[in-house]
């Protein structure tokens, strides 16, 4: 058998079984399930004198492990004293020790656990005509218990003859039922099940809570998108309230301006979510000039489920400004997907973080659903960056092999936009001078930024591929490098994926 450390258990008598005039008393410590021999048992008796006796180890027949008992007999004022049994098993490890501290005798009762359960609402979340509360008094040493129901702290006149007691092994359980009319339950009173046992009081309380406990309602207020602000010139802000429990009470959203000037008419939309919660949005058109000049807009939210009114405010972001740098590139052909390509656009070092990203093909803006753009993330410096990804089809690039990634940002000049063109096959197409790049080279991340994509499929570059500085004829930002394949007999610019 392999080495096994012991399990240690205190051995005590019940207090009620020890005569009150006893001058000495014996307690013990069981070490069991250990292998191999021996264990060393020592006792800390505090200020008292005691004699110890460790019985010879016995073998546990099924496992072949050992068990032993050490007994301590103490005399004097043992009732108030705590004793520590210390078991050491050096075969487990030189410092393996288990301490158990306990008194001479165990409490002579196990106190009950009191818990109130309530009957369910119906499927629609409504309360039935009567509500049952069930008080479960469980896990106590059999004995007399007294159950009292309280309503807002006052004793209720309840027929307790329905209380039933059951015994499971050494412990007993009792349950008492209270039936309430819907009117009483909805009146928001607190109901308490109070249990008196062995001179102690135990209780649990409950009350109607569905209307009052919010699930964690959140309110958010967005700033206008740069696209709406600078291109469409019809900016809007949206107040979003989420995680509302559906109820008769309606959400009240009130718009105001810090300047006290009147606000435009807002539009409101309510939507029930799959998880049963309600989402409310209110959209307010704002003046382009008002916004740019720094007006603060406020959305005040009240609802029966909210402990207090919530206010959200928004205004133009303050602080330094920096225009975005835009870099667009295409992934080379991947085996098995000849008729599709992914275009990527890195937009970085802009401040503040508000940015709109668009893709254009044939001078037409592609729907937002076509591309996926990350949320702005902070660079190691003070700016922000985003990635945008667009999947294009062979039909599109054969029609015209030029796609434009455009960033709309307040610091971009002259017209709040910066764009880069990218081609799927740059050698074949008359690609824009804005986006020169060597054929089939790939941008690599040199560790200066977080959040850049890894190689396709999560792979890492080929062992012979290293991230080296891009050539001088390829204009790229300093934190992006070119991945060079050094394998013999292959073209010097072979794509292995993003680093």
């Amino acid at each position: 058998a392999s080495t096994q450390s012991p399990s240690v258990f205190p051995l005590t008598r019940c207090c009620k079984n020890i005569p009150s005039n006893a001058t000495s008393v014996t307690l013990g410590c069981l070490a069991t399930g250990y292998f191999p021999e021996p264990v060393m048992v020592t006792w800390d008796t505090g200020s008292l004198n005691g004699t110890t006796m460790t019985l010879p180890a016995t073998t546990l027949t099924l496992s072949g492990h050992y068990a032993t008992i050490s007994l301590l007999t103490v005399s004097g004022a043992w009732a108030k004293q705590m004793f520590t049994c210390r078991v050491a098993h050096t075969p487990s490890s030189t410092d393996w020790v288990d301490n158990k501290t306990f008194s001479v005798c165990s409490r002579d009762f196990t106190p009950p656990t009191v818990k109130i359960l309530q009957s369910s609402c119906d499927g629609g979340g409504h309360f039935p005509p009567t509500i049952q509360l069930l008080c479960l008094v469980s896990g106590y040493t059999p004995g007399t218990i007294n159950i009292t129901w309280l309503e807002d702290g006052q004793v209720m006149d309840v027929d307790l003859s329905t209380a039933s007691t059951t015994q499971e092994g050494e412990l007993a359980s009792t349950q008492s039922e209270l039936t309430l009319s819907q009117k009483h339950w909805l009146s928001d009173r607190t109901y308490t099940c109070q249990v008196t046992y062995q001179g102690h009081t135990f209780e649990d309380s409950t009350k109607k809570c569905a209307d009052s406990n919010p699930r964690g309602v959140s309110a958010y207020l967005s700033r206008p998108s740069p696209f709406d602000l600078f291109i469409r010139k019809s900016p809007t802000i949206t107040c979003l309230v989420v995680d509302l429990a559906p109820s008769k009470g309606t959400v009240n959203l009130t718009w105001s301006r810090a300047s006290g000037k009147p606000v435009n008419h807002s539009t409101r939309k309510e939507e029930k979510q799959r998880n049963g919660t309600l989402t409310v949005t209110s959209t307010l058109p704002v003046g382009t000039r008002d916004w740019i000049e720094g007006e603060t807009y406020q959305c005040r939210v009240t609802h029966p489920h909210l402990p207090r009114a919530l206010m959200r405010s928004t205004t133009k972001t303050s602080g330094p400004r920096a225009a975005p740098e835009v870099y667009a590139f295409a992934t080379p052909e991947w085996p098995g997907s000849r008729d599709k390509r992914t275009l990527a656009c890195l937009i970085q070092n802009f401040m503040p973080e508000d940015i709109s990203v668009q893709w254009l093909h044939n001078e037409v803006q592609l729907p937002d659903a076509r591309h996926s753009t990350t949320q702005p993330r902070k660079t190691k410096g003070s700016g922000f960056f985003v990635f945008s990804r667009l999947e294009v089809t062979r039909a599109e690039w054969e029609q015209k092999d030029e796609f434009i990634c455009r960033a709309v940002h307040e610091a971009a000049s002259p017209s709040q936009t910066v764009q880069r063109a990218v081609s799927v096959n740059p050698g074949l197409a008359g690609g824009s001078a804005q986006s020169q790049r060597a054929p089939d080279r790939v941008l690599c991340h040199s560790g200066q930024q977080q959040g850049l994509p890894r190689a396709a499929g999560g792979s890492v570059p080929h062992p012979r591929c290293h991230c080296g500085a891009g050539r001088a004829d390829w204009p790229g930002p300093p934190e992006l490098d070119v991945c060079v394949e050094e394998a013999e007999g292959e073209a010097p610019w072979t794509w292995t994926g993003l680093c």
């Epitope: 919010p214 959140s218 406020q298 029966p304 402990p307 207090r308 009114a309 919530l310």
Partner: antibody, heavy 119, light 110 residues
């Protein structure tokens, strides 16, 4: 001007009950969420309960079951009922007004009423 | 529940000193952090709301800053009447919190 005046405090035995009142003046009570905050002698501020403008209420976990907040806008009064009082409930109880526009804390406090629980 | 942890619990400073008290929330607060000043025998007084907005009648030497989970109250030049206890409060409890106040910071005369 805005005024909140608490009353109903005093010496009470453990297990007893008290009803604290808060008389509001100088503003429209129905427009404001109202809060009770307590402060044990020499200790920090402790939130007890809030009642919103709709009359719905919330309690600190430890207060649920023994504390009941209510309001009567027609009488410009907010109440706090405390049942089965314990020694640890000894504190100054403040009635406080939440700002109207929300999310901004308490802009007016009463002077407080002292509740002493002792046998 | 969002817990508010205030530090230090006390600070000794002299008139004219710059004093900063910090408050850490166990979760991000979207808006609504308030600061209060309390003098012995008086109720608290609102100093700052919405993280950084000065309440009416509060001197400009008081300022509030921070976002997310970290907040600070700064007194740029301590005046004799500023010796008091200061509390932060998470005042935006749509997420119902058990105690919305920090433990307090006592600013004492050095």
């Amino acid at each position: 001007q805005v005024q909140l005046v608490e009353s109903g405090g005093g010496l009470v035995q453990p297990g007893g009950s008290l009803r604290l009142s808060c008389a509001a003046s100088g503003f429209t009570l129905s427009n404001h969420d109202m809060t009770w905050v307590r402060q044990a002698p020499g200790k920090g501020l402790e939130y007890v309960s809030i009642i919103n403008t709709y009359g719905n209420h919330w309690y600190a976990n430890w207060a649920s079951g023994r504390f009941t907040i209510s309001r009567d806008n027609s009488k410009n009064t907010v109440y706090l009922q405390i049942d089965r009082l314990r020694a640890e409930d000894t504190a100054t109880y403040y009635c406080a007004r939440e700002t109207h526009h929300g999310s901004s804390g308490i802009d007016h406090w009463g002077q407080g009423t002292l509740v002493t629980v002792s046998s | 529940d969002i817990q508010m942890t205030q530090s230090p619990s006390s600070v000794s400073a002299s008139v004219g000193d710059r004093v900063t008290i910090t408050c850490q929330a166990s979760e991000s607060i979207y808006s609504g952090l308030a600061w209060y000043q309390q003098k012995p025998g008086q109720p608290p007084k609102l100093l700052i709301y919405d993280h950084s907005t000065l309440a009416s009648g509060v001197p400009s030497r008081f300022s509030g800053s921070g976002s997310g989970t970290e907040y600070a109250l700064t007194i740029s030049s301590l005046q004799p009447e500023d010796f008091a206890t200061y509390y932060c409060q998470h005042a935006d409890y749509a997420h119902h919190s058990d105690n919305v106040f920090g433990g307090g910071t006592k600013v004492e005369i050095k």
